[in-house]
């Protein structure tokens, strides 16, 4: 079998809401993946599991099942949404994200995704990790790749 390539493209959109009484931020983050099947037979994308981390803490998880199949030598773009909650020990972010004197309230999140594919009863898992900028101050739609965080000073996970 040839490889199945998974490429994390980036954040597509982030929709934000707040709970003043709880000093809590809710971020619905939609991400885009490209999955390429380099084989001469179809493969099933069985599931996608994703999680988002902030300050080394998991703030959101999602799982999609029985997603799609990808034909021979074909590629499919898949969007998946992770609902995240920034609260309690991370509630210092509430002040930053709701501060009206700042135009862009970028925070750095770590996106982790694992894609499970199957073909002829064989299962394969491919994982990706990326740091991304997300604006927690307003609803934002991104150009693909626009939210990539490229700073070499990435925290040790």
């Amino acid at each position: 079998p040839r490889s199945i390539d998974v490429k994390y493209i980036g954040v597509k959109s982030a929709y934000v809401s707040y709970d003043v009484q709880k000093r809590t931020i809710y971020l619905n983050i939609t991400n885009t993946l490209n999955i390429t099947n380099n084989n001469y037979y179809s493969v099933e994308v069985e599931n996608i599991t994703a999680q988002v981390q902030f300050a080394k803490t998991v703030i959101g998880k999602a799982r999609l099942n029985n997603i799609t199949h990808i034909g021979p030598l074909d590629m499919k773009q898949i969007d998946y949404t992770v609902p995240t909650v920034i609260a309690e020990e991370m509630s210092y972010m509430y002040d930053f994200c709701t501060l009206i004197s700042i135009k862009v309230h970028n925070i750095v999140l770590m996106m982790q995704v694992t894609v499970t594919t199957t073909y002829f009863g064989h299962s394969e898992q491919i994982s990706q990790e990326r740091y991304q900028y997300v604006d927690c101050g307003r609803n934002t739609t991104y150009q693909l790749g626009q939210s990539e965080y490229l700073n070499v000073l990435q925290p040790q996970q």
């Epitope: 009484q21 300050a55 020990e89």
Partner: antibody, heavy 118, light 107 residues
Framework: QVQLQQSGTELARPGASVKVSCKAS????????ITWVKQRGGQGLEWIGE????????YYNEKFKDKATLTADKSSSTAYMELRSLTSEDSAVYFC???????????WGQGTTVTVSS | DIQMTQSPASLSASVGETVTITCRAS??????LAWYQQKQGKTPQLLVY???MLAENVPSRFSGSGSGTQFSLKINSLQPEDFGSYYC?????????FGAGTKLELK
């Protein structure tokens, strides 16, 4: 105005336990956390842990996990820290503070002095 | 755990002078740093959090800057009430550690 009123000086024997209280007023108690900090002999500050009264979720510094227990009573807007198995190393001033998250205290109590002596 | 290194340990200055205190994190903490002032025998007071956000009722002569691993607190035109100890504290993950402190004394 926001105020945090801590209980008075505690004198305890080695091996005993003490419970320090921190009564909050001037804000909605369940909106913020309460963080606890230790200061020995006018030296540096050490974060012990914090509690979020809305959910009763607690976050501890590993170093203090077996030493301190944080609780909160929503009805009286009071947070408590119990220190157990006291030794001379626990003699210090203990502060409570309203937490903006992850130990960032924006309003502080006046401090409670705990002295452990036989 | 993330360690915070503060410098200098002590500093002498006169009223009206401008001073800068620095704080270094052992790893990237982005902008998530707070600064406190503590006067002798008193309770700590939050000055700055999220790197440069001034806390309530803090005079504008105080300013925080930096990101990543290097941060500084600048006090313009020192006033008599500014003398005391200053602590940095990261608030990126647990435990949120403090620096050892800087004692600012009147020259």
């Amino acid at each position: 105005q926001v105020q945090l009123q801590q209980s008075g000086t505690e004198l305890a024997r080695p091996g005993a336990s003490v419970k320090v209280s921190c009564k909050a007023s001037g804000y909605i108690f369940t909106t913020y956390g309460i963080t606890w900090v230790k200061q020995r002999g006018g030296q540096g500050l050490e974060w012990i842990g914090e509690i979020y009264p809305r959910s009763d979720n607690t976050y501890y510094n590993e170093k203090f996990k077996d030493k301190a227990t944080l609780t909160a009573d929503k009805s009286s807007s009071t947070a408590y820290m119990e220190l157990r198995s006291l030794t001379s190393e626990d003699s210090a001033v203990y502060f409570c503070a309203r937490s903006k998250g992850s130990g960032t205290g924006d309003y502080w109590g006046q401090g409670t002095t705990v002295t452990v002596s036989s | 755990d993330i360690q915070m290194t503060q410098s200098p340990a002590s500093l002498s200055a006169s009223v009206g002078e401008t001073v800068t205190i620095t704080c270094r994190a052992s790893e990237n903490i982005y902008i998530y740093l707070a600064w406190y002032q503590q006067k002798q025998g008193k309770t700590p007071q939050l000055l700055v959090y999220n790197g440069k956000m001034l806390a309530e009722n803090v005079p504008s002569r105080f300013s925080g800057s930096g990101s990543g691993t290097q941060f500084s607190l600048k006090i313009n035109s020192l006033q008599p009430e500014d003398f005391g100890s200053y602590y940095c504290q990261h608030h990126y993950g647990s435990p949120p550690a403090f620096g050892a402190g800087t004692k600012l004394e009147l020259k």
